[in-house]
């Protein structure tokens, strides 16, 4: 007799789930020498004690906290990108600009990056055809827990001059329900962090406003401000010679404003 | 059985651009990095570089930076090298190469090779 | 860089004899070292990683040892098919390096 299961509104497990986690995890040591020490059988083991047998609406920080530990790693704090809504042209950057990371160029952002899973209360099988949506369903599930608990650690790990990728193209450039909004905003320390830098990234090709003076814009310095975290604004105005800027500093084109 | 095969011979002039092929069969493609590793004639061996397939990111030897290019498409799991402003000294027979995560990080699985003649 | 220095270049055996060929890192490396062998015209094949342990495949016969910067490849009694050129790697950091290989010929 087939067991009743639970019907949630968002995407089931991504497929291979376990072998794409495993796989990203050599992966990530072979790229990055100074993490060989990692034992990704342990990590693997530690993301799937996470949520495996746990009802996908009831996932805590805590759930999280061995696989946090096995995921330690220390990037230079001064040389973090935050984004929002805009992440394939923050990767773009960081692939160009190789000091500086996005929370996707550390071993746990790696890991879970584009990926979706949950489990089941009581049964150790993984849920491939459905899990709860974030607004639908549930918000302690466990791809937004895992993403609220390594924001916040990468947010509080930032120092001196944070960088944060914004989308002009859209209605809220800054918008409070995001993650960088809800979490990382909230959790850059005061007594770390100098300032917040946001780069407005304009989609449009004759698109010259000063997008800065944005009333989202304006809503982020306010709540930086009153975090006693100086705030600064830039505009992006050609995103694809911003990057190419970014790969030859030295080309005659690149003094003018990007 | 893994498999990684790599295009035919080439032979360029000086200052062209030769694109090499290295289509993979037996695993899955996303899972693995892909190195490419140049052999000049009766020389030793030179790591070029690597590709994560899965998302695109590269990594050159300070050698070959500016003039190399690895790419990867997912649709047909092949991976590319790239190699522009040949010169004489390019001539060599050049390897896609991986490892095989369990095997350290030692190349586990290589092509067959693919010779590229820079002559003009 | 680190710079991977094999010694002999070329070294000439017997069939039966036990060679060893010498590799040093110019800076500590641990154990991230593999050995491999090649032969006229064709791609190079692992023997050795981890610089100890033996790949699939590999005739018990070749083992390696060492860490940090002093590695050795030994051939306990060489065979027919084992004369070919030999080249040791360091995977301990980018950009990743070889030696510059051992050519192991018939006396």
């Known amino acids: 007799v087939p067991r009743w299961r639970q019907q949630w509104s968002g995407p089931g497990t991504t497929k291979r789930f376990p072998e794409t986690v495993l796989a990203r995890c050599v992966k990530y040591t072979e790229i990055h020498p100074e993490m060989r020490h990692v034992d990704c059988q342990s990590v693997w083991d530690a993301f799937k004690g996470a949520f495996i047998s746990k009802h996908p609406c009831n996932i805590t920080e805590e759930d999280y906290q061995p696989l946090m530990k096995l995921g330690t790693q220390t990037v230079p704090c001064n040389k973090i990108l935050l984004w929002s809504r805009i992440k394939d042209l923050a990767h773009q950057f960081t692939q160009v600009q190789r000091d500086m990371f996005t929370l996707e160029d550390t071993l746990l952002g790696y890991l879970a990056d584009d990926l979706t899973w949950c489990g089941e209360f009581n049964t150790s099988k993984i849920n491939y055809q459905s899990c709860p949506d974030w607004r639908k369903d549930c918000s302690n599930n466990p791809v937004s827990v895992f993403w609220k608990t390594v924001s916040r650690r990468f947010a509080e790990a930032a120092c001196d001059v944070v960088h944060v990728m914004l989308n002009g193209s859209r209605s809220k450039i800054f918008d409070k329900n995001s993650t960088f909004g809800s979490v990382e905003v909230h959790n850059l320390q005061p007594e770390k962090v100098q300032t917040l830098e946001a780069w407005v990234i304009h989609g449009g090709r004759e698109d010259s406003r000063d997008l800065c003076q944005d009333p989202t814009i304006k809503e982020l310095e306010s709540i930086i401000s009153k975090r006693n975290i100086q705030f600064s604004c830039k505009n992006i105005y050609r995103p694809d010679k911003f990057l190419q800027c970014v790969k030859n500093p030295e080309d005659s084109s690149c003094t003018s404003e990007i | 059985e893994v498999q990684l095969v790599q295009s035919g011979a080439e032979v360029k002039k000086p200052g062209a651009t030769v694109k090499i092929s290295c289509k993979v069969s037996?695993?899955?493609?996303?899972?693995?990095?892909m190195h490419w590793v140049q052999q000049a004639p009766g020389k030793g061996l030179e790591w070029m570089g690597w590709i994560d397939p899965e998302y695109g990111r590269t990594d050159y030897a300070e050698k070959f930076q500016g003039r190399v290019t690895i790419t990867a498409d997912t649709s047909t799991d092949t991976a590319y090298m790239e190699l522009s402003s040949l010169r004489s000294e390019d001539t060599a027979v050049y390897y896609c190469a991986r490892s095989a995560h369990t095997t350290g990080f030692g190349f586990a699985y290589w092509g067959q090779g693919t010779l590229v003649t820079v002559s003009s | 860089d680190i710079q991977m220095t094999q010694s002999p270049s070329t070294l000439s055996a017997s069939v039966g004899d036990r060679v060893t060929i010498t590799c040093r890192a110019s800076?500590?490396?641990?154990?991230?070292l593999a050995w491999y062998q090649q032969k006229p015209g064709k791609a190079p094949k692992l023997l050795i990683y981890?610089?100890?342990s033996l790949a699939d495949g590999v005739p018990s016969r070749f083992s390696g040892s060492g860490s940090g910067t002093e590695f050795t490849l030994t051939i306990s009694s060489l065979q027919p098919d084992d004369f070919a050129t030999y080249y040791c790697q360091q995977y301990n950091n980018y950009p990743y390096t070889f030696g510059q290989g051992t050519k192991l010929e018939i006396k």
């Open positions: 037996g695993y899955t493609f996303t899972d693995y990095i």
């Open positions: 800076e500590d490396i641990y154990s991230n």
């Open positions: 981890d610089a100890n």
